[in-house]
């Protein structure tokens, strides 16, 4: 534990005048002054009634203000002579002396009062020398130290109580010992009395010292009866910002050009590549102008920036769908969550980009249009003989952060020939319990000769699908369950490919006893 | 692509009723009917019925009429079951499917309890 | 209704090895159009069933070519080549012929 303070009640070391204690009887002990080691002028009390036997002398101090003390401790210093040195005296000499207290709220003893016993008095201790001299030898100083409590009162007395000893009283210091005030786990505890036992721990709550927080609660410590402190109970560390200084008992902030994230007793640390700080106690570096940092981004990753645009864009065009491909940006941003954006526009007339508009929704892309992580996408269903522009953007975890639109490259590209558009309608001729005969026109916009039809149908309930082909725009679907609803698609077929499907149709077969009964129907797209 | 979301356990008192619900997404709802079957823990599957979307006409298993009701929210791509007069013996998983060759939903496992 | 038995409750394989699931039903469910309307299911632990066969022997999309299906009207076979550690699960039967639907009470395919 820390050093002990103690604080001293009464010392007659430093008192040059008369010390004026009370005696009784007067013949008893006398008041002399001396000198101690340091050959400083002292006040001592002495006693050396040996000669006569039956002796009770007593000595009373001052009155001494207790201070909120609950336990008191008494250093002794004294001599004592040897009897076996004092020739013809009788064998009552002693070479001990009582220690006595007497507690009161003011000082109200007189040369009477309290009666000169014990209890009244309470008895502190029998104290004995450990060394007592002979008249050829000089005095050698004893030093004890006893302590009594709880006490309760304003104030108390000291007592001595002589029963025949030859003996100097050479000086009396009454203290009382508190724990010093203390930084311990980054937590400030205050000065602290000790408790009424030397077995007590008087609990000192803690503070955190400035620019540390609480981690583990209550923040207590616990001052022994010797002024010492134990069993520490709680823990600040350093705030955020702030790292450890002088072993633990400060909070220093972070210099500029450093940071700390997190509370705890790391150290500061410098800030990441592409940012800075400007003022001491930084939590987070920021990022140079351009850079950023993604919102899932930690506070020690290093600001990073947009991409370059992808370079090397390839398309291949093929009817009214192409492929692009392109490759890496050449600078990635300092990043690896690259993604990229195909921006389509359809252009009007011979004019530049002034004359381009985003593309219609129907327009397909595969894998998908935004977010890709692959190099290539697929596009379909543009317009036969038309002029597009495609930009295909980089972007990574900042470029929502940054106030300039993605970074692109662009191509532009013309389609050629076109599939047959969607077959407008279907209509059922007759259906019986196991076929249906249906009929179409062919699509609005053929884009060339139409080869054939191809009819997929399936079953509402199973959901598993087929497929048929006819040279007509009609057909006979067989095999068919009675009772049942077929969802019927029809798509035409020219040189440049399928078309669309027609959108889905819905029919049904009759029941198996019905008749195959003309249904002439016109099935609208559903 | 094709789904079929089913909402978590649900925990019913006997004598109640419920209703299951089915989210469809990635076709086209009424192309297809949707199915329900049951299956107790440990056991086999039991068909309930199928509904179409794009009318609510239904067929039920004989052995659910009554227990069984079954609807569609077209608006919302939704099919739903009520079961009613909640027994121990309706605590199961029941699923929906697209059509009665799926793909099916993850099911929602119904105890009745007190 | 259509019953649909499954004898074997549960077949033990080994990896690598071929096994087969049966499945009777008590009606023949060919069809007056030529096609059998046998299905058969697989449904892993804690999953829901996916389709492995339809209309007795035609491969679902996306179901790997070691799965095949045979039969006559009434007594059908799964036959599985070379079993991998995925294929686990109880396999069913399903008759979609008529209502209502009924399914056989699986096999479990365990490993040894």
């Known amino acids: 534990g820390c050093r002990a303070l103690e604080e001293t009640l009464m010392d007659t070391k430093w008192v040059t005048s008369e010390l004026a204690w009370t005696s009784h009887p007067e013949s008893g002990w006398e008041e002399v002054s001396g000198y101690d080691e340091a050959m400083n002028p002292i006040r001592t009390y002495q006693v050396c009634n040996v000669r006569e036997s039956s002796q009770n002398n007593w000595l009373r101090t001052g009155f001494i203000w207790r201070r909120d003390v609950q336990r008191v401790y008494v250093e002794l210093k004294f001599t004592v002579r040897d009897c076996n040195s004092i020739p013809n005296i009788p064998g009552s000499c002693k070479e001990t002396f009582n220690l006595f207290y007497y507690e009161a709220d003011s000082d109200v003893a007189s040369a009477s009062s309290p009666f000169w016993m014990e209890n009244p008095y309470v008895k502190v201790d029998t104290i004995a020398p450990d060394e007592s001299f002979s008249r050829l030898d000089a005095g050698r100083v004893n030093t004890k130290v006893r302590s009594f409590g709880p006490l309760s009162k304003a104030g108390f007395y000291l007592a001595f109580q002589d029963q025949g000893a030859c003996m100097s009283l050479i000086s009396v210091r009454a203290f009382y010992k508190k724990c010093a005030s203390t930084t311990a786990g980054f937590a400030l505890f205050p000065e602290t009395l000790t408790g009424a036992e030397p077995t007590s721990l008087v609990i000192a709550p803690g503070t955190c010292i400035p620019n540390a927080v609480e981690v583990s609660v209550p923040l207590k410590l616990y001052c022994n009866g010797d002024g010492e402190w134990m069993v520490p109970v709680g823990a600040c560390t350093c705030a955020t910002g702030h790292e450890p200084a002088a072993k633990e008992s400060q909070c220093r902030p972070c210099p500029p050009g450093s940071y700390k994230a997190k509370q705890g007793e790391g150290p500061c640390l410098p800030c990441p590549p592409n940012s800075r700080t400007t003022s001491p106690a930084a939590s987070i570096c920021t990022c140079h102008n351009n850079f950023y940092r993604a919102d899932s981004d930690s506070a020690d990753s290093a600001c990073t920036t947009v991409p370059s645009p992808p370079r090397g864009v390839i398309s291949n065009v093929n009817e009214t769908s192409l492929i692009l491909e392109w490759s890496e940006p050449r600078d990635l941003g300092g990043r690896d969550d690259l993604l990229y954006n195909v921006i389509c526009k359809k252009c009007h007339g011979a004019g530049g980009a002034s004359a381009c508009s985003r593309c219609d929704d129907n327009v397909e892309f595969v894998p998908r249009q935004l977010g890709l992580t692959e190099r290539r996408v697929h596009i379909s269903h543009l317009l036969a003989h038309t002029r597009y522009t495609f930009e295909v953007q980089a972007v990574n975890g900042v470029s929502g952060k940054s106030p300039l639109p993605p970074r692109y490259a662009a191509v532009n590209i013309t389609t050629n020939q076109a599939a047959p558009s969607e077959v407008p309608t279907l209509r059922l001729h007759s259906s019986s319990g196991s076929s249906l005969t249906l009929s179409w026109a062919p699509p609005e916009r053929p884009n060339g000769v139409i080869l054939d039809y191809e009819m997929k149908y399936f079953e509402k309930s199973e959901g598993i699908a087929s497929t048929v082909t006819s040279q007509m725009n009609s057909v006979q679907l067989d095999g068919l369950r009675p009772d049942a609803r077929y969802v019927v698609q029809v798509r035409a077929r020219t040189v440049a490919g399928y078309g669309q499907y027609s959108r889905p149709a819905e029919f049904e077969t009759t029941s198996e006893r019905g008749s195959g009964a003309q249904q002439l129907q016109e099935q609208l797209p559903l | 692509q094709v789904q079929l979301q089913q909402p978590g356990p649900d925990l019913v008192m006997p004598g109640a009723s419920v209703k299951l619900s089915c989210k469809a997404s990635?076709?086209?709802?009424?192309?297809?009917?949707i199915h329900w079957v049951k299956q107790r823990p440990g056991q086999g599957l039991e068909w309930i019925g199928q509904i179409d979307p794009s009318d609510s006409s239904t067929d039920y298993n004989q052995k659910f009429k009554g227990k069984a009701t079954l609807t569609v929210d077209k608006s919302s791509s939704t099919a739903f079951m009520q079961l009613s007069s909640l027994t121990s013996e309706d605590s199961a998983v029941y699923f929906c499917?697209?059509?009665?060759?799926?793909?099916w939903g993850q099911g929602t496992t119904l105890t009745v309890s007190s | 209704d259509i019953v649909m038995t499954q004898a074997a409750p549960s077949v033990p394989v080994t990896p690598g090895e071929s096994v087969s699931i049966s499945c009777r039903s008590s009606k023949s469910l060919l069809h007056s159009n030529g096609n059998t309307y046998l299905y058969w299911f697989l449904q892993r632990p804690g999953q829901s069933p996916q389709l492995l066969i339809y209309r007795m022997s035609n491969l679902a999309s996306g179901v790997p070519d070691r799965f095949s299906g045979s039969g006559s009207g009434t007594a059908f076979t799964l036959r599985i080549s070379r079993v991998e550690a995925e294929d686990v699960g109880v396999y069913y039967c399903m008759q979609h012929l008529e209502y209502p639907l009924t399914f056989g009470a699986g096999t479990k395919l365990e490993l040894k």
């Open positions: 990635g076709y086209t709802f009424t192309n297809y009917y």
């Open positions: 499917a697209r059509s009665s060759t799926g793909p």
